[in-house]
Amino acid sequence: QESLSCDASGVCDGRSRSFTSIPSGLTAAMKSLDLSFNKITYIGHGDLRACANLQVLILKSSRINTIEGDAFYSLGSLEHLDLSDNHLSSLSSSWFGPLSSLKYLNLMGNPYQTLGVTSLFPNLTNLQTLRIGNVETFSEIRRIDFAGLTSLNELEIKALSLRNYQSQSLKSIRDIHHLTLHLSESAFLLEIFADILSSVRYLELRDTNLARFQFSPLPVDEVSSPMKKLAFRGSVLTDESFNELLKLLRYILELSEVEFDDCTLNGLGDFNPSESDVVSELGKVETVTIRRLHIPQFYLFYDLSTVYSLLEKVKRITVENSKVFLVPCSFSQHLKSLEFLDLSENLMVEEYLKNSACKGAWPSLQTLVLSQNHLRSMQKTGEILLTLKNLTSLDISRNTFHPMPDSCQWPEKMRFLNLSSTGIRVVKTCIPQTLEVLDVSNNNLDSFSLFLPRLQELYISRNKLKTLPDASLFPVLLVMKIRENAVSTFSKDQLGSFPKLETLEAGDNHFVCSCELLSFTMETPALAQILVDWPDSYLCDSPPRLHGHRLQDARPSVLECHQ
């Protein structure tokens, strides 16, 4: 049997050591003990008694099925206890009585059906994070379960086999910053929602089939809910259940952010929110995020005209990797307050983008992200976006563009352009001179000779440049990142010719460690202030004698350099 390895600060690692019991020889010097991935099965009353100063105890996936009632009695300093993914079919309040300092407790993934006969947590007054439940057996949440807990930063409940929720079970916790609920269906959702309205600031619902969700008025008095964010992950919705969910918003008037991640919509977008009387109550929602939305019948999807009015005040919308090929012109025109729009990883092409960015579309838009779509012509793209009078930032990275023409038109306020990973080989005057930030990283550029009088930041890593670009091209440059190119050297003169340069990242290039370069680096200790990745990323490529040495450590041969 292997032994523990401990460092000088008392952090002991005993993961995956084939322990069949808690190892002997534990001492009061231990601050942290990780015995995960063993085959311990049993923790006896004396096994941990020597660990009086232990602050962290991690016992996950160690096949523990029995813990004696007083096994943790000496662990008054313990702040972090992880018992997740073991074989504990019942939980005992006597384990937690002595753990008055505990801040983090993870009991998830054990095969218990309830949280025990009596309240488990009344002494855990410092608890900040609690994770409970499992996929297959945890079937009941009762009023006694959370007694004694008044405030939590994070509460995660995996109740994917829930058969009974006792009303008001979660109401006793007065303040929960982030509640994650794994529910397989919506059966108890309304009851739970009523209980957490006045306590939860961020509610995350996971893996819930909401297809049969039906709203009914909540049995609550006028409540000022602190909920600011609502997220659905891995959920299933229909057009009808979406309408029903919207009715919940009348109870959370401070809601500012809604997120749908990895969800499925078994519908056509035939929403009818006017019936749900929520149009005015969506007033505070500023951010809507949709990622990986799966719509089996996306090719029959409606134009969403029924939700136009819902979204008039929204400022930030992300719809990522969801097969978006068109935002109808009339929809774009209704998004009057929209300042940020991210349509990354979709199916946008120029002809449909033209319809989306029609006259009067997105009048407040400042940032548009069209990364990884199917755009081909930089010239057309710029021309189409001329309608966006307030656009300052455009990300069209990860599109495969045709060669860049000599001239292009762009929105006149544009200051930031991301052309990374677009396959470009040459930069031309198509790139607007108004830019303050330009990202052309991960392309096939072997030179850069474009005058950009206002450019403050240039990102040109992962290209094929052999030298730093000429400083006269960028008179006000502050930041240049030129990692992973083929730059072989830089000199005092080169760096000095950038009058305002504050940050240069030039590591992982093919440096030829010549006498000049090495004497410059030796004579200039201030390099560390400008080269943010100095010294570890600056290695000699040649001569062979110095290959792999850091420039900082490499010493030129006296013979070579003083001939």
Partner: nanobody
Framework: EVQLVESGGGLVQAGGSLRLSCAAS????????MGWFRQAPGKEREFVSV????????DYASSVKGRFTISRDNAKNTVYLEMTSLEPEDTAVYYC???????????????WGQGTPVTVSS
């Protein structure tokens, strides 16, 4: 209606590995949550693992976590169970199931395969 056919079971020595497959017929495979269950001789059917429609969420019984891995390929209408560090206690008939709910309760699954036997010898 979905038909499920498991394969990949067999006899393996303790510490060995197996990969179970479950092929589904029907065009709506990606609309279902997929689960693996097992039943040892003389015992009740027990939950092993579950994966959501996209493959973005997975869960395991504590007895197999860290040793088994569930995955799915919606293009091939197939769900897999990669089993490593097998133990004699893993001997059972393994069933694949499809349903609408992401859960470990077997009764919530609508469609079941015929099962594939796995025997782990010591």
């Amino acid at each position: 209606e979905v038909q499920l056919v498991e394969s990949g079971g067999g006899l393996v020595q303790a510490g060995g590995s197996l990969r179970l497959s479950c092929a589904a017929s029907g065009r709506t495979f990606s609309s279902y949550v997929m689960g693996w269950f097992r039943q040892a001789p003389g015992k009740e059917r027990e939950f092993v693992s579950v994966i959501n429609r996209s493959g973005g969420s997975t869960d395991y019984a504590s007895s197999v976590k860290g040793r088994f891995t569930i995955s799915r390929d919606n293009a091939k209408n197939t769900v897999y169970l990669e089993m490593t560090s097998l133990e004699p206690e893993d001997t059972a008939v393994y069933y694949c199931a499809a349903g609408e709910y992401y859960t470990g309760i077997s009764s919530r699954y609508d469609y079941w395969g015929q099962g594939t036997p796995v025997t782990v010898s010591s």
